[in-house]
């Protein structure tokens, strides 16, 4: 957030900006959680998404029999071991064509045991608050495909009729990461120091970081005809004056007409 | 680039033999495979026999003692000696060659093709 400053006043405001902000020779810019002619103010809202797809990583665990091991396979630039990712990543591509979060598969390690196949299956969804079911779904799909074509696609006397074979007994799920995606937690980071203040609020399934300075939320404060303001102690009510009355109180609601004080003072004078 | 140069087939009678030969490039495919595959009219491209670097070499059951498939390094060759013909035998023959020791005739396990050449058996 930017505030733009004219007149002989911008050399002074240079070197008073706030909370790590930066002079660009008009204005102060300001970090992510401040705005104001000097930085000085902090925002009520931040944005944290949510992002736009989830990913999952699969690691998992087959045997090719229909390729022999040898020592270049363990060259990941070997002719070797290009040419048998291309075909594992031809043949899983067939294997994973249903499934609709499938992107691919990632090779980590070859060895021997026939060729045991160390790899990563990448599955990517749009963001919606029931992504985890979605990849879960996913991921027991993938399961049931891998189980099945290493079951069906063996060798027969020797020899492979398929693009690849497998042994039935070397497939393994190892492992199973879904990027976690928390909006209280990234609300809290984001916040810094401010992060005991700021919530989440959920809008048409949407998540908002706030803090009470924003306004329309069920945590909302009212500072009536003041301006919410947040400090490192909270949010607090800065109450105006106005021609005819003084505000205080913890939410501005208390107003005191300047006319009875004045009649007052004139009244002891 | 590797190059794979088939030749050597022909219209030969039922019962009658000839014998195929595969020229490749270099000898990039000494410790990898080869193979041979065959297409007849309207029909699906499929694996005949297979030569690893290992010594090993394997057949498709439709060929099993009429075929035999050898290599002679020294000349990056690849051949495919074939007896007792039959009018079934009739289909382009092509080579194939793959880095890895391959024990897989299906022709989607490898990834480096010759021209073919046509092989004709008459009843």
């Known amino acids: 957030r930017t505030t733009t400053c004219f007149g002989d006043g911008c050399q002074n405001t240079a070197s008073r900006c706030k909370n790590g902000g930066t002079w660009d020779g008009l204005k102060c810019q300001c970090p992510n959680l401040y705005y104001g002619e000097l930085c000085e103010e902090v925002v009520s809202s931040i944005d944290i998404g949510p992002p736009e797809t989830i990913s999952a990583q699969m690691e998992l665990t087959v045997t090719v029999t229909s390729v022999k091991f040898t020592e270049e396979l363990k060259n990941h630039s070997s002719q070797e071991f290009q040419e048998f990712k291309q075909t594992f990543t031809e043949q899983m591509n067939i294997v994973y064509s249903g499934i609709p979060e499938y992107v691919g598969v990632n090779i980590t390690k070859l060895r021997l045991g026939s060729v045991v196949v160390e790899h990563d299956v990448l599955l990517r969804t749009k963001y919606t608050p029931e992504y985890k079911t979605v990849l879960d779904n996913a991921t027991e799909v993938v399961k049931e495909k891998i189980t099945k074509v290493t079951t069906q696609q063996i060798m027969i006397n020797d020899i492979c009729s398929d693009m690849m074979c497998f042994n039935t007994t070397g497939t393994q799920v190892q492992n199973i990461t879904v990027t976690q995606y928390d909006p209280e937690e990234d609300c809290r980071k984001m916040a810094k120091e401010y992060g005991d203040y700021f919530v989440v609020e959920y809008r048409d399934q949407k998540p908002y970081c706030i803090s009470p300075c924003e306004p329309g939320f069920s945590v909302s404060k009212n500072c009536n005809l003041g301006k919410c303001q947040m400090s490192l102690s909270g949010p607090q009510c800065l109450c105006v004056t106005t021609e005819t009355h003084w505000y205080s109180g913890e939410t501005c609601n208390q107003g005191t007409q300047k006319s009875l004080v004045y009649g007052h003072h004139h009244h002891h004078h | 680039d590797v190059q794979l140069q088939a030749s050597g087939g022909g219209s030969v009678q039922a019962g009658g033999s000839l014998r195929l030969s595969c020229a490749a490039s270099?000898?990039?495919?000494?410790?990898?495979?080869m193979s041979w595959f065959r297409q007849a009219p309207g029909k699906e491209r499929e694996g005949v026999a297979i030569?690893?670097?290992?010594?090993?070499?394997g057949y498709a059951d439709s060929v099993k003692g009429r075929f035999t498939i050898s290599q002679d390094n020294a000349k990056n060759t690849l051949y495919l000696q074939m007896i007792g013909l039959k009018p079934d035998d009739t289909a382009m023959y092509y080579c194939?060659?793959?880095?890895?020791?391959?024990?897989?005739?299906?022709?989607?396990?490898?990834?480096?093709w010759g021209q073919g050449t046509q092989v004709t058996v008459s009843s």
């Open positions: 194939a060659a793959s880095f890895l020791v391959l024990r897989a005739l299906n022709p989607k396990a490898w990834h480096y």
């Open positions: 270099d000898n990039t495919f000494s410790r990898g495979s």
């Open positions: 030569i690893s670097s290992d010594g090993w070499t």
